[in-house]
């Protein structure tokens, strides 16, 4: 694992987008509540959205957005197991991920929509923890008394921390592998171009690689296919 950590430190520039990212940790099988505070005056009249970041510079795929009528933004809207509700006066967007699963881990954004544009309110890194209380009595329902007792064991009272400038984040393995792959692909592409130029070949034939970036036996970075904004 140590070589991997050293490799990660080399790739940390690839995770520049994770600076000022807030980490929310949730327990598998339970619910996770993500809050995104914002300036209610600045974003007055704007609908909000929750999207999943597909890769470092990829698009942010919409998961769910608030009610089409801004005045009804307080109404909870669902897409599958993800809900969104907006306290427009208090300036807090709340996203609930129910029945959290390992594949929910990843980078997300809270967005403020205006026309076809979207401002990022907060970048969120969702981490999924193994359930430390697998046989806990309370089961999957959430009771405030339990969250005060167990603190981080019940995750709708979620753990969050900010990744400030200068702090080196250590994100989930799936993201790190993706970044490592991107980094290595860049190196391979550069090497191929250099080799092609050196040998006078066409820069189309890459040397075979044994790296299979799409398949991590432990954790796969799964995107959410065909999500519709209901």
């Amino acid at each position: 694992m140590e070589p991997l950590r050293l490799l990660i430190l080399l790739f940390v520039t690839e995770l520049s987008g994770a600076h000022n990212t807030t980490v929310f940790q949730g327990v598998a099988g339970q619910s996770l509540q993500v809050s995104c505070p914002y300036d209610s005056m600045k974003h007055w009249g704007r609908r909000k959205a929750w999207c999943r970041q597909l890769g470092e510079k990829g698009p942010c795929q919409r998961v769910v957005s608030t009610h089409n009528l801004w005045l009804l933004s307080f109404l909870r809207r669902w897409n599958g197991s993800t809900a969104i509700t907006d306290d427009t006066l208090g300036g807090t967007l709340t996203i609930t991920l129910r029945n959290l699963q390992p594949h929910d881990a990843g980078l997300y954004q809270c967005q403020s929509l205006h026309g076809s544009e979207a401002d990022t309110l907060r970048k969120v890194l969702v981490e999924v923890l193994a359930d430390p209380l697998d046989h806990r009595d309370a089961g999957d329902l959430w009771f405030p008394g339990e969250s005060e007792s167990f603190e981080d064991a019940h995750v709708e009272h979620s753990i969050s921390r900010s990744l400030l400038e200068g702090e080196i984040p250590f994100p989930p393995t799936s993201i790190l592998l993706l970044l490592a792959c991107i980094f290595l692909i860049k190196i391979l592409a550069a090497s191929a171009l250099w080799a092609a130029a050196w040998h006078g070949q066409k820069p189309g034939t890459h040397p075979p690689s044994e790296l299979d970036c799409g398949h991590d036996p432990g954790y796969q970075l799964q995107t959410l296919p065909g999500l519709r904004d209901t």
Partner: antibody, heavy 122, light 113 residues
Framework: EVQLQQSGPELVKPGASVKISCKTS????????MHWVIQSHGKSLEWIGG????????SYNQKFRDKASLTVDKSSSTAYLELRSLTSEDSAVYYC???????????????WGQGTSVTVSS | DIVMSQSPSSLAVSVGEKVTMSCKSS????????????LAWYQQKPGQSPKLLIY???TRESGVPDRFRGSGSGTDFTLTISSVKAEDLAVYYC?????????FGGGTKLEIK
Amino acid sequence: EVQLQQSGPELVKPGASVKISCKTSGYTLSEYTMHWVIQSHGKSLEWIGGVIPNSGGTSYNQKFRDKASLTVDKSSSTAYLELRSLTSEDSAVYYCARGDDSYRRGYALDYWGQGTSVTVSS
Amino acid sequence: DIVMSQSPSSLAVSVGEKVTMSCKSSQSLLYSSNQKSYLAWYQQKPGQSPKLLIYWASTRESGVPDRFRGSGSGTDFTLTISSVKAEDLAVYYCQQYFSYPPTFGGGTKLEIK
């Protein structure tokens, strides 16, 4: 109008099982939790457990963990309570009740079914 | 489990009178994050299902007459009916939903003289 319509009274033999249904209408089942409460004759109310229809996640009162099983069928907007290994002590009225979730009102039970009477007798 | 104790177990009042009933919990129901007490009051009329009257200790459910008022915080709670009507004949239960498992009080039976 929100309605919770429970199945009719049951007369069952000791040791048998019974499955009570709670058909919901007037709201989206998956947006609320569903709870089951028992009321033994002339007594107070006891929470059996609750289910999150969206995920199927459940929570049981320790006392009823070996007695009850909660499920939902989202396609028919129906919640179920199955009771097993019944004894005469399980004779009671069983209610389904809609619970809001923890963000608005916690699990205050705002709509109740009419109750299903279960009598265990040989 | 949190124990909910209601008193009195029964009381008889005349129409138009003010009535108060008490509910005490064995531990605080106040959630520090939102400063709300996770306590509800229900009314169960003879032969009927329970009906939610009050949640978060003092918030009236929509459609509930304003003669019903919930108060209290932490461990001591009160349900007050400012001017009793004949239709208020029922058993009143308090319930905590602060901690697993949710528990109900034994009930207060309100009779009309």
